[in-house]
Interface confidence: low
Amino acid sequence: MMTGTIETTGNISAEKGGSIILQCHLSSTTAQVTQVNWEQQDQLLAICNADLGWHISPSFKDRVAPGPGLGLTLQSLTVNDTGEYFCIYHTYPDGTYTGRIFLEVLESSVAEHGARFQIP
């Protein structure tokens, strides 16, 4: 039975040109995390494998940094980075847990005024 839950940073906004940390945390389970995948829609951004370490997809190498922890840092943000991001935790014996984060990248002036994107 899957007892765990994924806590995420939820819906977040950031400035164009800036950086943001995507964080997920798996709690309420003693399952062993064997691998975490970070995906944007259907694109693989990065993998953190318990035995092999980090892999960043070649197309994101310049703008994505591993960590902190099992999180992911996105740099040099563009408006095109707006969208859904998923952390996929592969665990034993529970199976797969998925967390969702929505990022909106705003023009600098808008972000400065504290505008936030909300999903109803």
Epitope: Q32, T34, Q35, N37, L44, I47, N49, A50, D51, L52, G53, H55, H90, T91, Y92, P93, T96
Partner: antibody, heavy 125, light 112 residues
Framework: QVQLVQSGAEVKKPGSSVKVSCKAS????????ISWVRQAPGQGLEWMGS????????NYAQKFQGRVTITADESTSTAYMELSSLRSEDTAVYYC??????????????????WGQGTLVTVSS | DIVMTQSPLSLPVTPGEPASISCRSS???????????LDWYLQKPGQSPQLLIY???NRASGVPDRFSGSGSGTDFTLKISRVEAEDVGVYYC?????????FGGGTKVEIK
């Protein structure tokens, strides 16, 4: 259906090098471990090393360290095994084999399936 | 390095009868993720090896259900419930728990 096709037989002189290729078709090349295993005539199987193209770095058996280089070209889905300073004891059939093909919780050199058809390398003066 | 010891070295079998091969490792093959990193391969005469069982007890795709793998830690067994003529060849166990990956010496199965 994943298939591995290896390059043809080679005859080499002692002290020279050989480079065997292994072309993968089907499945996800980047996230699959490609391993090299050799079998001397009438003998058992011996692991030489493995690479996961996704992670780039290869692991080698201590016995072959410094003599073997395993690389992968993701543009052609081809892995290579180069063995240098050849001696007669290196006469063997060299197999490439593939690990789990998907980026799921178990990733690595966990099992080998499928295997290439094998490449006979004969070292003789 | 982890040493893999197979027995017997040779196994003459009668078609229709069961057969069993043992494989022992010098260290535990149980990973913290709960899986035993132990595989079984069959190399038929003149062919490349083929995967039979992975992670201790999982039958590979297309492998007949007369083959089964069991065991945990350091002791593993491959069983063939009813041997068929096409099962002849050399059977190898392999550990993938630690680098370097190592194979057992092989068990040659032949028809009596």
């Amino acid at each position: 259906q994943v298939q591995l096709v290896q390059s043809g037989a080679e005859v080499k002189k002692p002290g020279s090098s050989v480079k065997v290729s292994c072309k993968a078709s089907g499945g996800t090349f980047l996230s699959s471990a490609i391993s090299w295993v050799r079998q001397a005539p009438g003998q058992g199987l011996e692991w030489m090393g493995s690479i996961i193209p996704l992670f780039g770095k290869a692991n080698y058996a201590q016995k072959f360290q410094g003599r073997v280089t395993i690389t992968a070209d993701e543009s052609t889905s081809t892995a290579y095994m180069e063995l240098s300073s050849l001696r007669s004891e290196d006469t063997a059939v060299y197999y490439c084999a593939r690990g789990p093909s998907e980026v799921k919780g178990i990733l690595g050199y966990v099992w080998f399936d499928p295997w290439g058809q094998g490449t006979l390398v004969t070292v003789s003066s | 390095d982890i040493v893999m010891t197979q027995s017997p070295l040779s196994l003459p079998v009668t078609p229709g009868e069961p057969a069993s091969i043992s494989c022992r490792s010098s260290q535990s093959l149980l990973h913290s993720n709960g899986y035993n990193y132990l595989d079984w391969y069959l190399q038929k005469p003149g062919q490349s090896p083929q995967l039979l069982i992975y992670l201790g007890s999982n039958r590979a795709s297309g492998v007949p259900d007369r083959f089964s793998g069991s065991g945990s830690g350091t002791d593993f067994t491959l069983k063939i419930s009813r041997v068929e003529a096409e099962d002849v060849g050399v059977y190898y166990c392999m550990q993938a728990r630690r680098i370097p990956i190592t194979f057992g010496g092989g068990t040659k199965v032949e028809i009596k």
